[in-house]
């Protein structure tokens, strides 16, 4: 516990509870201390969201949350004289904020974003059911390293989906990836209900595909050398090397971790390249190699996104069928 004495009488409610939105999805509640609080009371404020989630007892007269404003959100606040959760706070005062107005059926759906190679973010969405086919969409985005909200310029269409991509480069600040990008999609004419999303930078990361530089045989081993995608540190990636053999019609898959080019068979000291030796490959048959890469779940939470496959490269000779 903390604070001063805890009088038995309930404290008066907080005053002037108000709510505002900063950036796109940062909702901030502020309030003033109660009028006529006990003089021997060291004030603490109890607050929770409407569904009794995220209870907090703190001395500050503000509370904020990063939340996509697609539905109404309410905060209840009360005052008390200690940090004790069992102490009954004052009457709770509630303040809610509603999403922007508009027909819910007009809002875009399936709004999602992928951070490509830690260099640009590509978001896509489907039009709402109640929208005209010629709707002109605008995507706005904000994250902590931006001073103001930015508008995404590169709107495109891919089949049924609309999308937009914008530069988002990982900065050296180690805490950068602990934050999120706030996204809003609406139309220029203001006819559709805006849609919001929050994209944590530890999720939805898709590396670029590797680039195979060289294949060579040494005895019955196949040596594979490739260029890694830029921007990642080694503990955050692993590789899947697939080798297809034309004669045996087998395809072997290898997960690759330690990929240093230390063997004399490899071209050495080449910046940002990795190497792997595939054992027991028949040199007198055609072997086709391709590689893809994935992020480690300990670095990036999303564990579903592989890179695209690299371009294939082949070595050996195709046997004539007799």
């Amino acid at each position: 516990g903390g604070g001063g004495a805890a009088p038995t009488e309930t404290q008066p409610p907080v005053t002037n509870l108000s709510v505002s939105v900063e950036n796109l999805c940062t909702v901030i509640w502020t309030w003033n201390p109660p009028e006529g609080a006990s003089s021997n009371c060291s004030l603490w404020y109890f607050s929770h969201f409407g569904d009794k989630q995220d209870k907090k007892i703190a001395p500050e007269t503000r509370r904020s949350i990063e939340v996509p404003l697609n539905e109404r959100i309410c905060l209840q606040v009360g005052s008390q004289c200690s940090t004790n959760e069992s102490e009954k706070p004052s009457i709770l005062v509630e303040k809610c904020i509603s999403p922007p107005e508009g027909d819910p059926e007009s809002a875009v759906t399936e709004l999602q974003c992928i951070w490509h190679n830690l260099s640009y973010m590509k978001c896509s969405w489907l039009p709402g059911r109640n929208t005209s086919p010629d709707t002109n969409y605008t995507l706005y985005y904000w994250h902590r390293s931006l001073e103001k909200i930015h508008q995404c310029e590169n709107i495109f269409r891919e089949g049924q989906y609309f999308g937009c991509s914008f530069d988002l480069t990982k900065v050296k600040d180690s805490s950068f990836e602990q934050h999120s990008v706030q996204i809003m999609v609406k139309d220029n004419a203001g006819k559709i209900k805006p849609s919001f999303n929050i994209v944590p930078l530890t999720s939805r990361v898709k590396p670029d595909p590797p680039h195979i530089k060289n294949l060579s045989f040494h005895n019955d081993d196949l040596y594979v050398q490739w260029e890694n995608p830029q921007n990642f540190i080694s503990r955050c990636l692993f590789y899947e090397v697939e080798v297809n053999n034309s004669q045996t019609e087998t395809h072997n898959v290898f997960y690759v971790q330690e990929a240093k080019c230390e063997n004399p068979e490899f071209e050495r000291n080449v910046e940002n390249t990795s190497c792997f030796m595939v054992p027991g490959v028949l040199p007198d048959t055609l072997n086709t190699v391709r590689i893809r890469v994935k992020t480690n779940k300990l670095c990036y939470e999303d564990d579903k996104l592989w890179s695209n496959w690299s371009q294939e490269m082949s070595i050996g000779k195709k046997r004539n069928s007799t």
Partner: antibody
Framework: EVQLVQSGAEVKKPGESLKISCKGS????????IGWVRQMPGKGLEWMGV????????RYSPSFQGQVTISADKSISTAYLQWSSLKASDTAMYYC???????????WGQGTLVTVSS | EIVLTQSPGTLSLSPGERATLSCRAS???????LAWYQQKPGQAPRLLIY???SRATGIPDRFSGSGSGTDFTLTISRLEPEDFAVYYC?????FGQGTKVEIK
């Protein structure tokens, strides 16, 4: 040959501190994670946390965050698991294991038995 | 946090029989991260399968792994006497509670 060799068994009293070790050899120690796993008597395996000795980046399981500290000294290819104040409930076998980026534990130490009793 | 639930808790079989062990995740996971281990009394666990279906070095081909999404399976095609042990599935920070394969 990849090997992980752990320090010997320990018998301690509640409230005492302890640091156990795991020395790696036969591979590039800085290129793989080292994970720590607890197994209480007669129970299953519990993932405690990992360290990447290349840059000493650590991740803990929520259940063990604040309860133990994982560290590494890459100059001697050794990882450590330490407690500042042991409890009787810390009595268990502790394993270190090498972990590639895809998260499986492919080589294990022989285990260190820690007994905490007054 | 992902919870892995193994079934059955105990499997009583005879040598030569087929063993099928199940591991179910509380939410969909990438098969890249699913591993299986064998542990015998007084020994450290040993990696059998990684990436849901790839056999670790030196593991006999009677051990195979399959599955995706939330349901994963370890199959031992013909049980040998040395296969009677406890088997665990794992995905990063989560282990299943184990399945004991015992002699019938």
């Amino acid at each position: 040959e990849v090997q992980l060799v752990q320090s010997g068994a320990e018998v301690k009293k509640p409230g005492e501190s302890l640091k156990i070790s795991c020395k790696g050899s036969g591979y590039s120690f800085t290129s793989y994670w080292i994970g720590w796993v607890r197994q209480m008597p007669g129970k299953g395996l519990e993932w405690m946390g990992v360290i990447y000795p290349g840059d000493s980046y650590t991740r803990y399981s929520p259940s063990f965050q604040g309860q133990v500290t994982i560290s590494a000294d890459k100059s001697i290819s050794t990882a450590y698991l330490q407690w500042s104040s042991l409890k009787a409930s810390d009595t268990a076998m502790y394993y270190c294991a090498r972990m590639p980026n895809w998260g499986s534990l492919d080589h294990w130490g022989q285990g260190t038995l820690v007994t905490v009793s007054s | 946090e992902i919870v892995l639930t193994q079934s059955p808790g105990t499997l009583s079989l005879s040598p030569g029989e087929r063993a099928t062990l199940s591991c179910r995740a509380s939410q969909s996971i990438s098969s890249s991260y699913l591993a299986w281990y064998q542990q015998k009394p007084g020994q450290a666990p040993r990696l059998l399968i990684y990436g849901a279906s790839s056999r670790a070095t030196g593991i006999p081909d009677r051990f195979s792994g399959s599955g995706s999404g939330t349901d994963f399976t370890l199959t031992i095609s013909r049980l040998e006497p040395e296969d009677f042990a406890v088997y665990y599935c794992q995905q990063y920070a989560s282990f299943g509670q184990g399945t004991k394969v015992e002699i019938k």
